[in-house]
């Protein structure tokens, strides 16, 4: 797996040690995760034909993946930085159970899947520091997450492949929207 941002020897020597909440640091963290998702998508698409499948709706019924909507204030139209920051953090927290599901779904990219999961945890910490004054952030219920995980793992092979593909695609879209929004914060 690639070296996470801030752990590269060039960075360590750099005199401009940035606070963890700095715009550049958060941006780098998101891009690092996106690179990881890219690698995972490559394996998924090579292994199955899910990336071209038109039957996504069947699997999507079982999933409640976080998605940006107008009301979340993360788009150019109706942008609201406080509402949006809450949505980004809440969404990332909700994605964690799905990232846990991905952990045993990869053969050659097992390390990459772990890196995406761990880097997301770090990103959440960065953003929570940035949003220290916001108290509207709800954490998902562990019991609900555990039963969701069990349900997802009990699916047949085709649905598991499709679920993996949908999680990666949705997470990528969520992070790209977050990147655009955070630029204006």
């Amino acid at each position: 797996a690639p070296v996470p941002p801030g752990e590269d020897s060039k960075d360590v020597a750099a005199p401009h040690r940035q606070p963890l909440t700095s715009s550049e640091r958060i941006d780098k963290q998101i891009r690092y995760i996106l690179d990881g998702i890219s690698a995972l998508r490559k394996e998924t698409c090579n292994k199955s034909n899910m990336c071209e499948s038109s039957k996504e709706a069947l699997a999507e019924n079982n999933l409640n993946l976080p998605k940006m909507a107008e009301k979340d204030g993360c788009f150019q139209s109706g942008f609201n930085e406080e509402t949006c920051l809450v949505k980004i953090i809440t969404g990332l927290l909700e994605f964690e159970v799905y990232l846990e599901y991905l952990q045993n779904r990869f053969e050659s990219s097992e390390e990459q899947a772990r890196a995406v999961q761990m880097s997301t945890k770090v990103l959440i910490q960065f953003l929570q520091k940035k949003a220290k004054n916001l108290d509207a952030i709800t954490t998902p219920d562990p019991t609900t997450n555990a039963s969701l995980l069990t349900k997802l793992q009990a699916q047949n092979q085709w649905l598991q492949d499709m679920t993996t593909h949908l999680i990666l695609r949705s997470f990528k879209e969520f992070l790209q929207s977050s990147l655009r929004a955070l630029r204006q914060m």
Epitope: P5, A14, E24, K28, E81, E82, R183, Q184, M185
Partner: antibody
Framework: EVQLLESGGGLVQPGGSLRLSCAAS????????MSWVRQAPGKGPEWVSR????????YYGDSVKGRFTISRDNSKNTLYLQMNSLRAEDTAVYYC?????WGSGDYWGQGTLVTVSS | QTVVTQEPSFSVSPGGTVTLTCGLS?????????PGWYQQTPGQAPRALIY???DRHSGVPDRFSGSISGNKAALTITGAQAEDEADYYC?????????FGGGTQLTVL
Amino acid sequence: EVQLLESGGGLVQPGGSLRLSCAASGFTFSSYAMSWVRQAPGKGPEWVSRISAGGGSTYYGDSVKGRFTISRDNSKNTLYLQMNSLRAEDTAVYYCANRAGWGSGDYWGQGTLVTVSS
Amino acid sequence: QTVVTQEPSFSVSPGGTVTLTCGLSSGSVTASNYPGWYQQTPGQAPRALIYSTNDRHSGVPDRFSGSISGNKAALTITGAQAEDEADYYCALDIGDITEFGGGTQLTVL
């Protein structure tokens, strides 16, 4: 068409204060972070300050920290820069600019000249 | 304080290609620094050419292009014209602030 119009510049004595304004039109002002950039005569541009789209976060260059305050009024589509304890080295043309993003670049105004001299 | 470095001056023949660079005194330039390029002619406000590494500002001719090459941001002018003679400044987001380079004076001769 994006337009940014700075005003409020002028001649002020060292130690004095000045408040710059920037009236924005032609884009969704409340969706963009905004910056002030200055350029001293014969020098390159120097970033001064930035404020987030909703006004919740502000950032400053080392040379103005503690003396300048950036603010905005999204209901009036206006950006401000309150400059206190002015020094001769603050003499420059001050430009306001929106932060590139949402698929479009940054636009700059034509600037307002601030001269700090006794 | 991280310094943003640019070549002080450069010259190019009309029709020629020139690449101006923008680096950091320590570390590499990445997409997270959102490299931007500005052109300034005497008596005028700086004009944005490129934002976010390689996106061309509206109305900017396609002979101007941006990239990250190696550990630096780069502005390439392909088929330079007399009106391209100007000062060129790059800007990088570093942490929470923005730093401008000292500028490159480009001569077209």
